[in-house]
């Protein structure tokens, strides 16, 4: 087996993104300048660490959660890298074209980096159901259709729905699961004889795959209050997203021991359940006014997680291809929908508390905005599915998915592993 | 005792940049959104800009975009209001507010509690 | 885009006053109003539609949702001539309604 890219794959990959490379550096030299007003140094640190807690949980949390395959772990943490690293850039340019470039050269703020790392998280979610099928020309093209397809949503649902940053990045989690099993819908499926034991996990890297998740544990009430306005919001959000994530690691490591026959404790419902109360709590962590709340979706949401665990990979594997590891894509799916659901109901109360007689039409809305969302997403995702099918790419045979050797040189191993 | 002081406004051409200072004083303004709202000579009040509390984000009235910056440092409880190619349509009474949040169920309300006593921004050839 | 009717009215003291604030989609109850006298700055008076803003005469109220709002003086006392705007907070950057004036009858 060699340990070389194809030739056609090392010729198109370097030049692919190299050239995508130098038109950014030009359209950040031509089109963009940093703010000047900045008065408040240690203003500027305490932002920054917001940023710097979103980019930790990037890099290293979904770098390291997606690592949990045999023979895959190298290639899931850097290719996380590398997208988040273009993501981010193109993010910024595009959130700067679609809404400040009418009055003239985009601003580049610490908000507007804290907003591109958000967008490419995005892309970080989505792709755990493809990692391990596709090449890193590939998947340039999938981080410039998400991020593209994102930030124009984000635009949309702002202008016509009137929805706060907040409240339009908090589709991230629905838009990024269902754009990611679109393209895994698209991908060819079976893997070949022989190449089975490649998508199972190994212990070293679902250790990994266990530290990111911790970090992505740590680092969630950040991510949920770094859109919000006020510091009452900020606090709420952050307490809320705390005790509703607490409770659904109890929920998700008992929930897991009770799904299994013998008691035992799964480690591929363990890393992703963990997590669960983060997400469902996100739309609307803000607005919990309690704590016993946010740790009763906690609760739910753990157990929703470890049930999707036990029954939906066996669907999605023959359906999508997704490996059995790789359950972001419907965790966050039902999730998302689970917090998009909250949401409706607090906006139900809301309106029937101001004795409002809208409440169908504020639910028809919320319910447009959700729509809108997954319709983009999965059109998109098609879109990218497509695409990455074009032979131009020279995406990895079936025989060779989920194998580091393809891309990795490994001085110390003739073949396999 | 709960107050802001805006200073800086004056007379300048067309053309002109002008800088407005806003302190704050018997509260920390760093747990707050500030704002900038305007009232022409006779006329209505104009939101024209506001800044997060911590300084991260920034909004502006279309009619000003890309000609003012609102920024604040929070070391000093000032906020500022940067003023570049001002117009004859400028011409206002300039006050800065404080903005509170109120939770309600399905999103937060935000309204303006504090406001100063305003200064007077005269754009003239 | 707010809107406000009437644009202004003369009434005398003791009278019941009631201005109305119109907005161009629902904005639930996320709208606020101020009064202004004339050479001074803005005072909020009712936010979230309903709330009182504590020291503000328990006369003025506030109600409505959706689309449309209203301010009440129940008794208009010789301090409350000025002119009134409502605000609203829907939409991540405000806007006010062009403004009611108050004067003496």
């Known amino acids: 087996m060699s340990s070389k890219y194809p030739r056609s794959v090392r010729r198109c990959l370097p030049l692919w993104a190299l050239t995508l490379e130098a038109a950014l550096i030009l359209l950040f030299y031509f089109f963009t300048h940093y703010d000047a007003s900045l008065e408040d140094q240690k203003g500027l640190v305490a932002s920054y660490q917001v940023g710097q807690d979103l980019t930790v949980m990037a890099a290293i949390g979904l770098g390291f959660l997606t690592s949990s395959f045999r023979r895959h772990s190298w290639s899931s943490v850097a290719f996380n890298l590398f997208m988040l690293a273009l993501g981010v850039q193109w993010a910024i340019l595009l959130d700067g074209f679609l809404s400040q470039f009418p009055s003239g050269k985009v601003v580049i703020t610490l908000f507007s980096i804290r907003l591109a790392t958000m967008s490419a998280l995005s892309v970080l979610i989505s792709v755990d159901a493809v990692l391990g099928k596709v090449n890193l020309a590939q998947l340039v093209v999938m981080v410039l259709v998400e991020v593209t397809a994102l930030g124009n949503l984000r635009m949309v649902i702002s202008n016509i729905f009137n929805t706060d940053y907040h409240m339009n990045m908090m589709h991230i989690y629905v838009f990024a699961a269902y754009f990611g099993l679109s393209v895994a819908w698209c991908l060819p499926k079976p893997l070949p004889e022989g190449t089975e034991d490649k998508d199972q996990t190994a212990t070293i890297p679902s250790l990994s795959a266990m530290l990111g998740a911790l970090f992505l544990w740590m680092f969630w009430p950040s991510f949920n209050s770094a859109l919000l306005r006020s510091p009452i919001e900020r606090k709420n959000a952050v307490f809320n997203t705390y005790y509703a994530v607490a409770v659904s690691v109890v929920t998700a490591i008992s929930g897991s021991s009770l799904a299994h026959p013998q008691g035992k404790i799964s480690k591929t419902y363990v890393h992703s359940a963990v997590l669960a109360g983060g997400v469902a709590v996100g739309t609307s962590c803000h607005l919990i006014p309690s704590p016993w709340l946010a740790m009763v979706l906690g609760l739910v949401a753990g157990l929703i997680s470890v049930g999707g665990a036990k029954y939906l990979p066996g669907c999605c594997n023959r359906v999508l291809g997704i490996p059995h590891s790789s359950i972001m894509g419907y965790n966050f799916s039902l999730l998302g929908l689970l917090g998009e659901i909250i949401y409706i109901v607090l906006l139900v109360l809301d309106t029937v508390g101001a004795g409002n007689g809208m409440i169908g039409f504020q639910v028809l809305l919320s319910i447009g905005e959700l729509s809108l969302a997954i319709v983009i997403a999965l059109m998109s995702g098609l879109l990218t599915g497509l695409l990455l099918n074009l032979k131009i790419w020279k995406a990895p045979h079936e025989a060779k998915y989920f194998d580091d050797q393809v891309f990795w040189k490994f001085p110390h191993l003739a073949v396999g592993f | 005792q709960v107050k802001l002081l805006e200073s800086g406004g004056g007379v300048v051409q067309p053309g002109g940049s002008l800088r407005l200072s806003c302190v704050a004083s018997g509260f920390t303004s760093r747990s707050y959104g500030m704002h900038w709202v305007r009232q022409a000579p006779g006329k209505g009040l104009e939101w024209v800009a506001f800044i997060w509390f911590d300084g991260s984000n920034k909004g502006y009235v279309d009619s000003v975009k890309g000609r003012f910056t609102i920024s604040r440092d929070n070391s000093k409880n000032t906020l500022y209001l940067q003023m570049k190619s001002l117009r004859a349509e400028d011409t206002a009474v300039y006050y800065c507010a404080r903005e509170k949040a109120l939770r309600g169920i399905s999103r937060y309300n935000y309204y303006l509690d504090v406001w100063g006593k305003g200064t007077t921004v005269t754009v003239s050839s | 885009v707010m809107t406000q009717s009437p644009s202004s009215l003369s009434a005398s003291v003791g009278d019941r006053v009631t201005i109305t604030c119109r907005a161009s989609?629902?904005?639930?109850?996320?709208l606020n109003w101020y009064q202004q006298k004339p050479g001074k700055a803005p005072k909020l008076l009712i936010y979230?539609?309903?709330s009182l803003q504590s020291g503000v005469p328990s006369r003025f109220s506030g109600s409505g949702s959706g689309t449309d709002f209203t301010l009440t003086i129940s008794s208009l006392q010789p301090e409350d001539f000025a002119t009134y705007y409502c605000q609203q907070s829907y939409s991540t950057r405000f806007t006010f309604g062009p403004g009611t004036k108050v004067d003496i009858k």
């Open positions: 979230a539609a309903s």
């Open positions: 989609q629902s904005i639930s109850s996320y």
